[in-house]
Amino acid sequence: GPVPPSTALRELIEELVNITQNQKAPLCNGSMVWSINLTAGMYCAALESLINVSGCSAIYRTQRILHGLCPHKVSAGQFSSLHVRDTKIEVAQFVKDLLLHLKKLFREGQFN
C-alpha cells in the first residue's frame, strides 16, 4: 500500500540529514537551483527545482522520495507558480532550508 505521509516525511528528513551532515564541500558541485515557497505544494515545487540538477548522485534518493510525496508527475524544465523564480541558491542551501522547514512541520504534526 501507499507509504503514510508521516513515514515519508521522516524518510525525507533522514535522507536530507544524511547528505548534509558535516558537509562543507559544495553539494552537486555548487549547482544552483530555483528557491521555492516553503508552503502548500512544496514537495512538488522542491522536486521541480531539484529535478533540473543532473549527474549528482548525492540527491538521487531525495528526488525519489519527493516523487513519492508529489501527487503529480514532474519532469525537468517544468515549473509551477509556487516557485519564486527570481532567486537561485546553491543546492546545499536549498537542502538545508528545506530540511529545517520539514522538521518544523514534523514537530507541528503537519504531515501532508
Epitope: R10, I13, E14, V17, N18, T20, Q21, N22, Q23, K24, A25, K96, L99, K103, F106, R107
Partner: antibody, heavy 126, light 109 residues
Framework: EVQLVESGGGLVKPGGSLRLSCAAS????????MSWVRQAPGKGLEWVGR??????????NYAAPVKGRFTISRDDSKNTLYLQMNSLKTEDTAVYYC?????????????????WGQGTTVTVSS | SYELTQPPSVSVSPGQTARITCSGD??????AYWYQQKSGQAPVLVIY???KRPSGIPERFSGSSSGTMATLTISGAQVEDEADYYC???????????FGGGTKLTVLG
C-alpha cells in the same frame, strides 16, 4: 546549568556487561545528537559512537572496535543517554564520556555549544 | 578505517604562535573540530566547523582548513594553553567520527 552526568562505571570481568547512563539537563536533549567518547589510561580520545535525535532518524553509528558489542540508546522522556556494553574486553578499559555531537549541532538548537560529562571509569580485568 | 594525523608534540615560548596540524583525506569535504584537554579534565571545544570559535574561547584561538589539512593556531600562546589538543572530524560518509592522535602543546615558561 547545562550539564551531562555519567554513571554506571565500575570493575567488570572480561566477557561481562555494563550499562552506562548519561543524564542531561539545561538544554533541549531531544533535539541533540549525542556521542560517547572514551579515553584509555594515558592515551588519546577515541570516538565510540553516536545517536541522532529522534526527529533526524534516531539512527546510531559505531566505531569498528565496538560495533556489534556496544549499543547506544536514548530516552528523551528521561533526558538520558545510554551505552550498553557487552562482551567486554580488557582493551575497553577507559574513562567514558558522553557529549553533545558537534556534527549534529547544525540540526539541533545547540550550534557551537559544547557539553561533556565528567566521565565515568570502566575497568575490565580478571 | 579512516585516520586523522597530528604531530605528537609542539613546543613554543610564551607569546609565540603555535600551529597544530591535522591531516585527513576527507578534510576537503568534511569540517574539522578542535578540542583542548587539560590534565584530568574533560575536553573543551575550542574551534568548530574549521574556523568558528565558541563563545568563551579566547580570540587567540583560530582555525583554518586547506585541502587535506586543518590547522589550529594559537596566536600569542600563554602558559595556561599548555594542554593536549585533538582534532575531530568524520569519514567521507559523515557517519563515523574520528579523533586525531592528539598533540601535546608545551608552552616553555
Amino acid at each position: 546549568e547545562v550539564q551531562l552526568v555519567e554513571s554506571g562505571g565500575g570493575l567488570v570481568k572480561p566477557g561481562g556487561s555494563l550499562r552506562l547512563s548519561c543524564a542531561a539537563s539545561g538544554f533541549t536533549f531531544s533535539n541533540a545528537w549525542m556521542s560517547w567518547v572514551r579515553q584509555a589510561p594515558g592515551k588519546g580520545l577515541e570516538w565510540v559512537g553516536r545517536i541522532r535525535s529522534e526527529i533526524d532518524g534516531g539512527t546510531t553509528n559505531y566505531a569498528a572496535p565496538v560495533k556489534g558489542r556496544f549499543t547506544i540508546s536514548r530516552d528523551d522522556s528521561k533526558n538520558t543517554l545510554y551505552l550498553q556494553m557487552n562482551s567486554l574486553k580488557t582493551e575497553d578499559t577507559a574513562v567514558y564520556y558522553c557529549a553533545t555531537d558537534q556534527v549534529g549541532a547544525y540540526y539541533g538548537d545547540y550550534y557551537g555549544m559544547d557539553v561533556w560529562g565528567q566521565g565515568t571509569t570502566v575497568t575490565v580485568s580478571s | 578505517s579512516y585516520e586523522l594525523t597530528q604531530p605528537p608534540s609542539v613546543s613554543v615560548s610564551p607569546g609565540q604562535t603555535a600551529r597544530i596540524t591535522c591531516s585527513g583525506d576527507a578534510l576537503p569535504e568534511k569540517y574539522a573540530y578542535w578540542y583542548q584537554q587539560k590534565s584530568g579534565q574533560a575536553p573543551v571545544l575550542v574551534i568548530y566547523e574549521d574556523s568558528k570559535r565558541p563563545s568563551g574561547i579566547p580570540e587567540r584561538f583560530s582555525g583554518s582548513s586547506s585541502g587535506t589539512m586543518a590547522t589550529l593556531t594559537i596566536s600569542g600562546a600563554q602558559v595556561e594553553d599548555e594542554a593536549d589538543y585533538y582534532c575531530h572530524s568524520t569519514d567521507s560518509s559523515g557517519n563515523h567520527g574520528v579523533f586525531g592522535g592528539g598533540t601535546k602543546l608545551t608552552v616553555l615558561g
